[in-house]
């Protein structure tokens, strides 16, 4: 099914406009901003979601040390260019003709340049490290229970195949979720780790992208897991190319 048939809405993306104008009167949904048709049985790509967001009214155990090549999304929101499949185009430019290259999750991986900047290919982000700090609790969560609960969440809520959740680390109050997905591992129909991480990030911030589903209520054996800080690191299959001046 492409969308909820009974009331013609998109369960996996509330930033859509839906109408029963598909083949045979089927419900069809299009993303705001781009007008692209979306498959409502799975997550919408981060690129289309960012584009929709920019078009919306403007109201309102041993922990992993990220590698030297890990990227953090410091640039924040921008209005991206998406390809016909909804993926980020390798080169992104703003209205003032400033351009840069991005990875498959839309995070800048080069210095900014002008229109002559070339981005030969969209470099895949194959490893995502989600770093969370939870609010104080009476005691530490049981590691195995926490691990299982987060794996269940990514399977059930985001439809991410269990093989892509590489590890869950916990050193109270820090939780780290490692997602890994090489190009060769990702089969047709598999949810992309970048999309799953983005939905999770928005859920954690209380900005759920799901239609008609309650917000994220994370519990470990009934004990609420409340996140007070999130940092996401992105590792690409090819290391990013920044000049030394950025590092100083």
């Amino acid at each position: 099914h492409t969308a909820a048939q009974d009331n013609c809405t998109c369960p996996t993306n509330k930033m859509t406009v839906c109408s029963p104008d598909g083949p045979g009167g089927r419900c069809q949904c299009r993303a705001l901003g781009s007008g692209m048709a979306v498959d409502c049985s799975t997550l919408t790509s981060k690129c289309l979601l960012l584009k929709a967001r920019m078009s919306a009214p403007k109201n309102a155990r041993t922990l992993v040390r990220p590698s030297e090549h890990a990227l953090v999304d410091n640039d924040g929101l921008y209005d991206p260019d998406c390809d016909p499949e909804g993926r980020f185009k390798a080169r992104q430019c703003n209205q003032t003709s400033v351009c840069w290259c991005v990875n498959s999750v839309g995070v800048r991986r080069t210095d900014k340049g002008d229109l002559s900047l070339r981005c030969d290919e969209l470099v895949r982000t194959h490893h995502i490290l989600i770093d969370l700090r939870h609010r104080p609790t009476a005691g530490a969560f049981n590691h195995s229970d926490l691990d299982a609960e987060l794996r269940r969440l990514f399977r059930e809520r985001y439809r991410l195949h269990p093989k892509f959740v590489a590890a869950v680390h916990y050193e109270q109050p820090t939780i780290q979720i490692e997602l890994r997905q090489n190009t060769s591992q990702k089969a047709a129909g598999d949810v992309d780790i970048g999309d799953a991480a983005y939905y999770f990030e928005r859920d954690i911030k209380g900005e759920s992208l799901f239609q008609g589903r309650g917000g994220l209520d994370l519990r470990v054996r009934g004990e609420p897991l409340q996140v007070e800080r999130t940092l996401i690191y992105y590792l690409d299959e090819i290391p990013p190319k920044f000049s030394m001046k950025r590092l100083t």
């Epitope: 099914h1 909820a4 048939q5 049985s41 195995s144 691990d147 299982a148 609960e149 794996r151 269940r152 399977r155 059930e156 809520r157 439809r159 991410l160 195949h161 269990p162 093989k163 959740v165 590489a166 590890a167 869950v168 949810v191 589903r213 309650g214 519990r219 054996r221």
Partner: antibody, heavy 117, light 106 residues
Framework: EVQLVQSGPEVKKPGASVKVSCKAS????????IGWVRQAPGQGLEWIGE????????YYTQKFKGRVTMTADTSTSTAYMELSSLRSEDTAVYYC??????????WGQGTLVTVSS | DIQLTQSPSSLSASVGDRVTITCSAS?????MYWYQQKPGKAPKLLIY???TLASGVPSRFSGSGSGTDFTLTISSLQPEDFATYYC?????????FGQGTKLEIK
Amino acid sequence: EVQLVQSGPEVKKPGASVKVSCKASGFTFTDYVIGWVRQAPGQGLEWIGEIYLGSGTIYYTQKFKGRVTMTADTSTSTAYMELSSLRSEDTAVYYCARGSIFPFDYWGQGTLVTVSS
Amino acid sequence: DIQLTQSPSSLSASVGDRVTITCSASSSVSYMYWYQQKPGKAPKLLIYDTSTLASGVPSRFSGSGSGTDFTLTISSLQPEDFATYYCQQWSSYPYTFGQGTKLEIK
């Protein structure tokens, strides 16, 4: 073809332990989850817990915690569920089932465990 | 724990009848799953994500609902449909099943 083949029926005395095996074929074992469900005679389905085969992460329901142990041998693509301190109420058919982005997509044929003095 | 209550617990119907089984959850769930079980056999996945038919399942089966109320419908009963049906949720641990609905020949 995805297959889950379980071990044969068992008869145990109260207080004993039983270990049920579930041999998988037709898929990459460590990419999936194996859940365990039981069904007492003439009754409904009851979930026991699950094991993530790649990481060894396990979740048991509170009812069985302390009495159940789930393990996996990746070299033989076999999952195991051991239940200890058996009582007559544990008489049931025990099923293993594969989990992916669905909770249970393929099921084993079931193993009847009879607890009787 | 989320309790699932199926209605009715048993049902007698004839070939060709339209049959509806409901499943009510004690708190809101994202999706419902339905299984069919025949005597002496393992359950078989029938419907996932509330309304999507599993591979090989005939189109006479359909599922609907949201939140706490879900429905399984068989539009025209066939002889092979007489079995027990279970709903199941996994929106939170522990996964739970309904008590089952036994569909018998009238």
